[in-house]
Amino acid sequence: EPCVEVVPNITYQCMELNFYKIPDNLPFSTKNLDLSFNPLRHLGSYSFFSFPELQVLDLSRCEIQTIEDGAYQSLSHLSTLILTGNPIQSLALGAFSGLSSLQKLVAVETNLASLENFPIGHLKTLKELNVAHNLIQSFKLPEYFSNLTNLEHLDLSSNKIQSIYCTDLRVLHQMPLLNLSLDLSLNPMNFIQPGAFKEIRLHKLTLRNNFDSLNVMKTCIQGLAGLEVHRLVLGEFRNEGNLEKFDKSALEGLCNLTIEEFRLAYLDYYLDDIIDLFNCLTNVSSFSLVSVTIERVKDFSYNFGWQHLELVNCKFGQFPTLKLKSLKRLTFTSNKGGNAFSEVDLPSLEFLDLSRNGLSFKGCCSQSDFGTTSLKYLDLSFNGVITMSSNFLGLEQLEHLDFQHSNLKQMSEFSVFLSLRNLIYLDISHTHTRVAFNGIFNGLSSLEVLKMAGNSFQENFLPDIFTELRNLTFLDLSQCQLEQLSPTAFNSLSSLQVLNMSHNNFFSLDTFPYKCLNSLQVLDYSLNHIMTSKKQELQHFPSSLAFLNLTQNDFACTCEHQSFLQWIKDQRQLLVEVERMECATPSDKQGMPVLSLNITCQMNK
Amino acid sequence: QKQYWVCNSSDASISYTYCDKMQYPISINVNPCIELKRSKGLLHIFYIPRRDLKQLYFNLYITVNTMNLPKRKEVICRGSDDDYSFCRALKGETVNTTISFSFKGIKFSKGKYKCVVEAISGSPEEMLFCLEFVILHQPNSN
């Protein structure tokens, strides 16, 4: 069976084809080759000699037991080599020779017992080394690591490392500029020698499900003393063994580390006193809790010095009391409990993501809700009922506003967005908004993107509601049950580039409303009921138009509409997916492609 | 279409068939077997994925006695610092995991429950596997 040509001459997918040897019928120009799940078993030297341009090679689960000297010799452009799930028993010293551009080596689940004997010391370009799910017992980083000056990611998770000694990391002292992220999760650790991490600098350290008791966790974290780490991730996994006990003593050792960003990811334990628990983390710049349960929500008004707070997939009794003077970014998403939003006091806040919480807002939105006048980004999408009771007074700095899939109330009672002269992006898609007031978008003089799909209009008619949106470049009006539009609806949108009118109920096409759209490049009218043109004579669309989508409409392929069908043929160079433009009537022509139709009509006198 | 039996409990019998062409082997054990009146137990899965499990989610299509419920999307792996350790599993890596579950207080009516589980993962998104579970529910007298 042949390989699948994904990108001609470049990418070939040869997965699970029962190949016992490397195929010789692929072009020399192949750059990406997936040979996974084939029983190759043995790689002799120069195995890939006929792929001189190769950049990505996937050999996952190829039952490879032996890799000879120079197996990849000649692959001087290879950047990624994946060996996941091969039961390697014999790895020659020169197995990886010739890989002068290799940046990513994945040797997950390959029976690797030690880094010491892994022959990769010459791979100077290596950025990512993944040796997770192996049998490595010692964390001693071999001397050859001093050659790997570009290494950024080292994944040693799911190995058998129990102890870390001072001598294990000696090589890192010789590499002070290293920007290394290290994952040691799922190693059964019970001892870290104090001083092992002294004066070591890491970009990221991840330790999840490493400790089988509170005491072990406590002493191991104390063993990290002296470490300078940009981002520290601690926690557990839901499907692994969890700590039976967790209290403030667990994290006391963090006072002896220099940490820029901290994240606690999943803990099967109720956090009650977070002030004491995170006492050593009051001055990290970014603090993050993922999938934890928090009992006392008042604690978030303590004087923490965080600039970014992230609470994701957590459980709360009620919406937390947030009073944080220095906080600039708050991400509070996919949380449970506390369904009603209550005011927060965050005077420095610039970025606020409150999406996917099922929250309801009794009144939205003004400075008093968020305690800030600096807000630039606000995401309230995928929430409950949001009642618009104020038009963003004190929030004039907003540039990005997202309400999609929340239920907006009172949107047509006043000019909700009147204050937002700096707003660039607005999404009110699927918000149950019924447009019944022409001033709905007044004030949005800087707006560039407006998404309002899945809403409705009074009498299914699009009125002149965009008159002030002179900078708009993207407008989505799909799924709005529209049947008609004002001929001047788009007259002020001279910068508009993309207009989506798909999935509405238009029965005819008219070019007149688009005559002022001098920048229009994409017009999507798919999934309507267009049978014919509104006027007998259709003008041309703006000359800037490059893509016109008229697929899945109800074209009437009869003599009566001959001029419209001819007009469509004249637009051929603009049309996309023409094979999906089919006749709906008459029945004998149903399903026929409109463009292949040859209608010759005689005028009956 | 070959049917794979999972287990029997006092009020339910559970089996599955593949609903994709590939039919990559997957081993599923539930211990103790699910009882629909209330249940607590362990789900054990052994599987070698044909693509990375990063950003794994399930589309669930549930049918109760021929009545179709709306499609549900269950996100399992968000993409970074996920709840489950198997979210970091790579294509070709053995996934051998045990997940605890519990539910109570749901009354199910007698009949045949079908649940099509479409597992989607990776970037770009592609189907990982598709299984159709059949649960025959026979509420016992008490």
Partner: nanobody, 112 residues
Framework: EVQLVESGGGLVQAGESLRLSCVAS????????MGWYRQAPGKQGESVAI???????YYPDSVKGRFGISRDNAKNTVYLQMNSLKVEDTGVYYC??????RGQGTQVTVSS
Amino acid sequence: EVQLVESGGGLVQAGESLRLSCVASGISISTEIMGWYRQAPGKQGESVAIVKSDGSTYYPDSVKGRFGISRDNAKNTVYLQMNSLKVEDTGVYYCIMAGRGRGQGTQVTVSS
């Protein structure tokens, strides 16, 4: 056991030609991918010519139009014709049989 023996190397002036030969023993080359790989001191090795069993050939841009590879399956031999040699063509030239190995190499030196 597969053995590959190269010959034909030597010292030439820039602009001159050389023809390298490689005789294989222990296996028939007719179904094998064959080629030449060169290694210059202090430089990254590179494949300079490849020929598949169907006769299709590959040359990198650095030698395209100057080098030509051919095979004689009856003689179990592969040839590399090198014309308009440049100083940067200097190095050890190895005969390769994909997946099976290489010969001991033959030195080619091009002087200015």
